[in-house]
Protein backbone atom coordinates (compact mmCIF):
# COMPACT_ATOMS: atom_id res chain seq x y z
CA UNK A 1 0.00 0.00 0.00
CA UNK A 2 1.19 3.51 -0.35
CA UNK A 3 2.87 5.11 2.22
CA UNK A 4 1.14 7.65 4.91
CA UNK A 5 1.78 10.60 4.47
CA UNK A 6 3.50 12.28 7.55
CA UNK A 7 6.22 14.86 6.74
CA UNK A 8 6.21 15.15 2.72
CA UNK A 9 4.37 14.48 -0.21
CA UNK A 10 4.68 10.89 -1.46
CA UNK A 11 5.08 11.68 -5.05
CA UNK A 12 7.94 13.58 -5.48
CA UNK A 13 8.51 12.15 -9.35
CA UNK A 14 5.57 10.59 -11.69
CA UNK A 15 5.73 8.38 -14.35
CA UNK A 16 7.35 9.27 -17.43
CA UNK A 17 5.89 6.52 -19.48
CA UNK A 18 2.03 5.94 -20.44
CA UNK A 19 0.02 3.95 -18.32
CA UNK A 20 -2.26 1.69 -19.73
CA UNK A 21 -5.80 0.34 -18.02
CA UNK A 22 -4.82 -3.33 -18.86
CA UNK A 23 -1.47 -2.83 -16.89
CA UNK A 24 -3.18 -1.57 -14.09
CA UNK A 25 -4.47 -3.52 -10.99
CA UNK A 26 -5.19 -0.18 -8.45
CA UNK A 27 -5.34 3.54 -8.67
CA UNK A 28 -5.46 5.20 -5.83
CA UNK A 29 -6.02 9.22 -5.50
CA UNK A 30 -4.99 11.32 -2.18
CA UNK A 31 -6.58 14.65 -1.42
CA UNK A 32 -4.49 17.59 -0.32
CA UNK A 33 -3.68 16.89 3.37
CA UNK A 34 -1.56 18.68 6.19
CA UNK A 35 1.43 16.79 5.03
CA UNK A 36 0.85 17.39 1.33
CA UNK A 37 -1.37 20.04 -0.09
CA UNK A 38 -1.53 18.52 -3.57
CA UNK A 39 -3.78 15.99 -4.63
CA UNK A 40 -1.47 12.68 -5.53
CA UNK A 41 -2.27 9.83 -7.63
CA UNK A 42 -0.58 6.61 -6.88
CA UNK A 43 -1.21 3.41 -9.51
CA UNK A 44 -0.35 -0.19 -8.85
CA UNK A 45 0.83 -1.85 -11.67
CA UNK A 46 -0.25 -5.79 -12.40
CA UNK A 47 3.41 -6.58 -11.82
CA UNK A 48 3.50 -5.00 -8.82
CA UNK A 49 4.86 -1.35 -9.47
CA UNK A 50 3.87 1.46 -7.45
CA UNK A 51 3.79 4.64 -9.50
CA UNK A 52 2.71 8.01 -9.23
CA UNK A 53 0.86 9.68 -11.69
CA UNK A 54 0.97 13.65 -13.26
CA UNK A 55 -2.42 14.97 -12.01
CA UNK A 56 -2.40 17.94 -14.60
CA UNK A 57 -1.86 15.40 -17.53
CA UNK A 58 -4.30 14.79 -19.55
CA UNK A 59 -3.25 11.27 -20.23
CA UNK A 60 -3.66 10.60 -16.59
CA UNK A 61 -6.98 12.56 -16.44
CA UNK A 62 -8.12 10.19 -19.21
CA UNK A 63 -6.98 7.10 -17.41
CA UNK A 64 -8.57 8.21 -14.16
CA UNK A 65 -12.03 8.62 -15.90
CA UNK A 66 -11.59 4.78 -17.86
CA UNK A 67 -10.66 3.10 -14.51
CA UNK A 68 -13.87 4.46 -12.60
CA UNK A 69 -15.60 3.67 -15.04
CA UNK A 70 -14.34 -0.05 -15.14
CA UNK A 71 -14.78 0.47 -11.51
CA UNK A 72 -18.08 0.65 -11.40
CA UNK A 73 -18.97 -1.17 -14.43
CA UNK A 74 -17.14 -4.36 -11.56
CA UNK A 75 -19.49 -3.49 -9.12
CA UNK A 76 -22.61 -3.39 -11.18
CA UNK A 77 -21.56 -6.77 -12.50
CA UNK A 78 -21.12 -7.52 -8.77
CA UNK A 79 -24.08 -6.45 -7.55
CA UNK A 80 -25.86 -8.09 -10.94
CA UNK A 81 -24.53 -11.91 -9.59
CA UNK A 82 -25.97 -11.18 -6.49
CA UNK A 83 -29.02 -10.28 -7.98
CA UNK A 84 -29.20 -13.86 -9.74
CA UNK A 85 -28.01 -15.91 -7.04
CA UNK A 86 -30.93 -14.27 -4.66
CA UNK A 87 -33.28 -15.97 -7.03
CA UNK A 88 -31.81 -19.37 -7.80
CA UNK A 89 -31.82 -19.79 -4.38
CA UNK A 90 -35.66 -18.95 -4.63
CA UNK A 91 -35.92 -20.85 -7.18
CA UNK A 92 -34.48 -23.47 -5.19
CA UNK A 93 -36.54 -23.06 -2.10
CA UNK A 94 -39.63 -23.16 -3.79
CA UNK A 95 -38.65 -26.42 -5.81
CA UNK A 96 -37.87 -27.94 -2.42
CA UNK A 97 -41.24 -26.61 -0.70
CA UNK A 98 -42.77 -28.52 -3.93
CA UNK A 99 -41.56 -31.37 -3.44
CA UNK A 100 -41.92 -31.65 0.14
CA UNK A 101 -46.28 -31.48 -0.63
CA UNK A 102 -45.75 -34.30 -3.42
CA UNK A 103 -44.43 -36.83 -0.97
CA UNK B 1 21.24 10.80 -24.12
CA UNK B 2 19.76 11.37 -20.41
CA UNK B 3 22.14 13.89 -19.33
CA UNK B 4 22.62 16.38 -16.17
CA UNK B 5 25.11 19.17 -16.82
CA UNK B 6 25.67 21.71 -13.58
CA UNK B 7 27.30 25.10 -14.26
CA UNK B 8 27.93 28.23 -12.10
CA UNK B 9 30.29 27.07 -9.64
CA UNK B 10 33.46 29.07 -8.85
CA UNK B 11 35.50 31.06 -5.85
CA UNK B 12 33.69 33.18 -3.78
CA UNK B 13 34.03 34.79 -0.62
CA UNK B 14 32.23 34.19 3.02
CA UNK B 15 29.04 35.82 3.09
CA UNK B 16 28.64 36.64 -0.88
CA UNK B 17 25.91 34.38 -2.70
CA UNK B 18 26.46 31.87 -6.12
CA UNK B 19 23.83 30.36 -8.06
CA UNK B 20 24.50 26.75 -9.17
CA UNK B 21 22.17 25.91 -12.53
CA UNK B 22 21.91 22.28 -13.87
CA UNK B 23 20.64 21.87 -17.54
CA UNK B 24 18.60 18.64 -17.93
CA UNK B 25 18.06 16.91 -21.27
CA UNK B 26 16.69 13.40 -22.61
CA UNK B 27 13.85 12.80 -20.47
CA UNK B 28 10.97 14.65 -19.30
CA UNK B 29 12.00 17.15 -16.85
CA UNK B 30 8.42 18.20 -15.87
CA UNK B 31 7.82 14.65 -14.14
CA UNK B 32 11.28 14.47 -12.08
CA UNK B 33 11.70 15.54 -8.76
CA UNK B 34 15.18 16.88 -8.76
CA UNK B 35 17.91 17.13 -5.97
CA UNK B 36 21.27 19.17 -4.97
CA UNK B 37 24.17 16.98 -3.45
CA UNK B 38 27.46 18.03 -2.33
CA UNK B 39 30.15 16.02 -1.10
CA UNK B 40 32.96 18.31 0.75
CA UNK B 41 36.98 17.52 -0.43
CA UNK B 42 37.74 13.92 0.95
CA UNK B 43 34.25 13.67 2.21
CA UNK B 44 30.52 11.34 1.78
CA UNK B 45 27.60 12.33 0.16
CA UNK B 46 25.51 15.33 1.64
CA UNK B 47 22.35 15.76 0.36
CA UNK B 48 21.25 19.35 0.45
CA UNK B 49 17.93 19.85 -1.38
CA UNK B 50 14.83 18.47 -3.03
CA UNK B 51 11.85 20.37 -5.41
CA UNK B 52 9.29 18.03 -6.82
CA UNK B 53 8.37 17.52 -10.52
CA UNK B 54 5.98 20.34 -10.25
CA UNK B 55 7.96 22.64 -7.98
CA UNK B 56 5.03 23.06 -5.30
CA UNK B 57 7.54 20.92 -2.57
CA UNK B 58 10.39 22.13 -1.78
CA UNK B 59 12.74 20.25 1.29
CA UNK B 60 16.54 21.47 2.96
CA UNK B 61 18.92 19.99 4.58
CA UNK B 62 19.38 21.64 8.35
CA UNK B 63 22.56 23.01 7.33
CA UNK B 64 21.52 24.88 4.31
CA UNK B 65 17.94 26.06 5.61
CA UNK B 66 17.47 29.64 5.17
CA UNK B 67 20.36 30.07 3.27
CA UNK B 68 19.96 28.22 0.34
CA UNK B 69 16.69 28.10 -2.18
CA UNK B 70 16.25 25.40 -4.85
CA UNK B 71 14.31 26.29 -7.92
CA UNK B 72 13.35 24.97 -11.33
CA UNK B 73 12.21 26.10 -14.60
CA UNK B 74 10.47 23.82 -16.75
CA UNK B 75 9.80 25.58 -19.59
CA UNK B 76 14.24 25.84 -19.82
CA UNK B 77 14.70 22.36 -18.20
CA UNK B 78 16.89 23.68 -15.55
CA UNK B 79 17.29 23.59 -11.98
CA UNK B 80 18.80 25.94 -10.00
CA UNK B 81 20.64 26.47 -6.61
CA UNK B 82 20.18 30.05 -4.76
CA UNK B 83 23.32 29.98 -2.42
CA UNK B 84 23.32 32.61 -0.10
CA UNK B 85 25.36 34.27 3.11
CA UNK B 86 28.17 30.98 2.01
CA UNK B 87 30.29 29.58 4.91
CA UNK B 88 33.40 27.98 4.28
CA UNK B 89 32.36 24.81 5.11
CA UNK B 90 29.87 24.87 1.84
CA UNK B 91 32.88 24.40 -0.08
CA UNK B 92 32.04 21.26 -1.78
CA UNK B 93 31.30 19.66 -5.47
CA UNK B 94 27.77 20.31 -6.19
CA UNK B 95 25.70 17.37 -7.89
CA UNK B 96 22.40 18.05 -9.26
CA UNK B 97 20.68 14.63 -9.71
CA UNK B 98 17.23 13.27 -10.79
CA UNK B 99 14.58 11.01 -8.35
CA UNK B 100 13.83 7.99 -9.60
CA UNK B 101 11.50 8.30 -12.25
CA UNK B 102 8.26 6.19 -11.08
CA UNK B 103 7.93 8.61 -8.49
CA UNK B 104 6.82 5.70 -5.72
CA UNK B 105 10.19 4.23 -5.11
CA UNK B 106 13.44 6.88 -4.15
CA UNK B 107 16.38 7.08 -5.50
CA UNK B 108 18.52 9.23 -7.77
CA UNK B 109 18.99 7.53 -10.99
CA UNK B 110 21.23 9.93 -12.90
CA UNK B 111 23.65 12.49 -11.80
CA UNK B 112 25.69 15.39 -13.07
CA UNK B 113 29.23 15.36 -13.50
CA UNK B 114 29.78 18.17 -10.58
CA UNK B 115 30.58 21.79 -10.29
CA UNK B 116 32.99 23.09 -7.62
CA UNK B 117 32.21 25.61 -5.20
CA UNK B 118 34.96 26.58 -3.04
CA UNK B 119 34.23 29.76 -0.06
CA UNK B 120 37.59 31.42 0.70
CA UNK B 121 38.55 35.08 1.46
CA UNK C 1 16.21 13.18 11.73
CA UNK C 2 17.15 9.42 11.01
CA UNK C 3 20.88 8.88 11.24
CA UNK C 4 22.47 6.01 8.83
CA UNK C 5 25.51 4.18 10.33
CA UNK C 6 27.54 1.77 7.65
CA UNK C 7 29.98 -0.97 8.68
CA UNK C 8 32.44 -1.58 8.12
CA UNK C 9 34.03 1.66 7.42
CA UNK C 10 36.38 -0.31 5.33
CA UNK C 11 36.50 -3.79 3.72
CA UNK C 12 39.42 -5.26 2.58
CA UNK C 13 39.09 -8.29 0.45
CA UNK C 14 40.12 -10.00 -2.85
CA UNK C 15 38.56 -10.21 -6.65
CA UNK C 16 36.44 -13.40 -6.37
CA UNK C 17 35.34 -12.67 -2.42
CA UNK C 18 31.90 -11.81 -0.95
CA UNK C 19 31.59 -8.64 0.23
CA UNK C 20 28.66 -8.06 2.70
CA UNK C 21 27.81 -4.20 3.54
CA UNK C 22 25.29 -3.58 6.11
CA UNK C 23 23.90 -0.05 6.73
CA UNK C 24 22.10 0.61 10.25
CA UNK C 25 19.34 3.51 10.36
CA UNK C 26 18.05 5.10 14.12
CA UNK C 27 14.87 4.50 13.50
CA UNK C 28 12.29 2.67 11.16
CA UNK C 29 12.63 3.41 7.60
CA UNK C 30 9.94 1.87 4.62
CA UNK C 31 12.11 -0.75 2.11
CA UNK C 32 10.76 1.65 -0.48
CA UNK C 33 12.86 4.21 0.48
CA UNK C 34 16.17 2.96 0.88
CA UNK C 35 18.77 3.44 -1.91
CA UNK C 36 22.35 1.87 -2.74
CA UNK C 37 25.25 3.94 -4.20
CA UNK C 38 28.37 3.09 -5.65
CA UNK C 39 30.89 5.76 -6.12
CA UNK C 40 34.41 5.56 -7.88
CA UNK C 41 37.44 8.60 -7.20
CA UNK C 42 36.59 11.57 -9.05
CA UNK C 43 33.14 10.09 -10.28
CA UNK C 44 29.42 11.25 -9.71
CA UNK C 45 27.37 8.35 -7.53
CA UNK C 46 25.47 6.02 -9.25
CA UNK C 47 22.73 3.85 -8.39
CA UNK C 48 22.90 0.55 -7.68
CA UNK C 49 19.32 -0.45 -5.52
CA UNK C 50 16.32 0.96 -5.14
CA UNK C 51 13.60 0.34 -2.37
CA UNK C 52 15.74 -1.44 -0.33
CA UNK C 53 16.02 -4.49 -3.10
CA UNK C 54 15.37 -3.35 -6.50
CA UNK C 55 18.44 -3.37 -8.97
CA UNK C 56 18.52 -0.02 -11.01
CA UNK C 57 18.60 -0.45 -14.96
CA UNK C 58 22.29 -2.06 -15.95
CA UNK C 59 23.32 -3.09 -12.78
CA UNK C 60 25.13 -6.65 -12.92
CA UNK C 61 22.94 -9.32 -10.84
CA UNK C 62 25.99 -9.81 -8.43
CA UNK C 63 24.78 -7.01 -6.70
CA UNK C 64 21.60 -7.22 -4.37
CA UNK C 65 20.08 -5.52 -1.27
CA UNK C 66 18.26 -6.75 1.26
CA UNK C 67 16.65 -5.86 4.71
CA UNK C 68 13.98 -4.04 6.25
CA UNK C 69 12.89 -1.42 9.38
CA UNK C 70 16.44 -0.27 10.85
CA UNK C 71 18.78 -3.20 9.56
CA UNK C 72 19.72 -3.08 5.82
CA UNK C 73 22.19 -5.25 3.35
CA UNK C 74 24.09 -4.20 -0.01
CA UNK C 75 25.82 -7.84 -0.98
CA UNK C 76 28.29 -8.26 -3.99
CA UNK C 77 28.35 -12.33 -4.48
CA UNK C 78 31.75 -11.66 -6.41
CA UNK C 79 33.52 -8.87 -6.54
CA UNK C 80 34.95 -7.57 -9.99
CA UNK C 81 38.14 -5.45 -10.00
CA UNK C 82 35.74 -2.74 -11.18
CA UNK C 83 33.95 -2.64 -7.75
CA UNK C 84 36.20 -1.39 -5.64
CA UNK C 85 34.81 1.72 -4.56
CA UNK C 86 32.83 3.36 -1.64
CA UNK C 87 29.47 2.50 -1.13
CA UNK C 88 26.67 4.86 0.78
CA UNK C 89 23.39 3.55 1.73
CA UNK C 90 20.54 6.94 1.48
CA UNK C 91 17.45 6.92 3.30
CA UNK C 92 13.84 8.72 2.09
CA UNK C 93 11.96 9.09 5.36
CA UNK C 94 8.55 10.20 5.67
CA UNK C 95 10.56 13.57 6.76
CA UNK C 96 13.38 14.99 5.43
CA UNK C 97 16.11 15.61 5.55
CA UNK C 98 16.94 12.27 3.27
CA UNK C 99 20.55 11.07 4.48
CA UNK C 100 23.29 9.28 3.27
CA UNK C 101 25.51 7.12 5.58
CA UNK C 102 28.92 7.74 5.97
CA UNK C 103 29.95 5.27 3.54
CA UNK C 104 31.97 1.46 2.99
CA UNK C 105 34.91 1.63 1.02
CA UNK C 106 35.78 -1.41 -0.51
CA UNK C 107 39.65 -2.16 -1.29
CA UNK C 108 41.64 -4.87 -2.57
CA UNK C 109 43.29 -6.95 -0.03
Known amino acids: TPVVRKGRCSCISTNQGTIHLQSLKDLKQFAPSPSCEKIEIIATLKNGVQTCLNPDSADVKELIKKWEKQVSQKKKQKNGKKHQKKKVLKVRKSQRSRQKKTT | QVQLVESGGGVVQPGRSLRLSCAAS????????MHWVRQAPGKGLEWVAL????????YYADSVKGRFTISRDNSKNTLYLQMNSLRAEDTAVYYC??????????????WGQGTTVTVSS | EIVLTQSPGTLSLSPGERATLSCRASQSVSSSYLAWYQQKPGQAPRLLIYGASSRATGIPDRFSGSGSGTDFTLTISRLEPEDFAVYYC??????????FGPGTKVDIK
Open chain 2, 97 to 110: ARDWPEGYYNGMDV
Open chain 2, 51 to 58: IGFDGINE
Open chain 2, 26 to 33: GFTFSNSG
Open chain 3, 90 to 99: QQYGSSPPFT
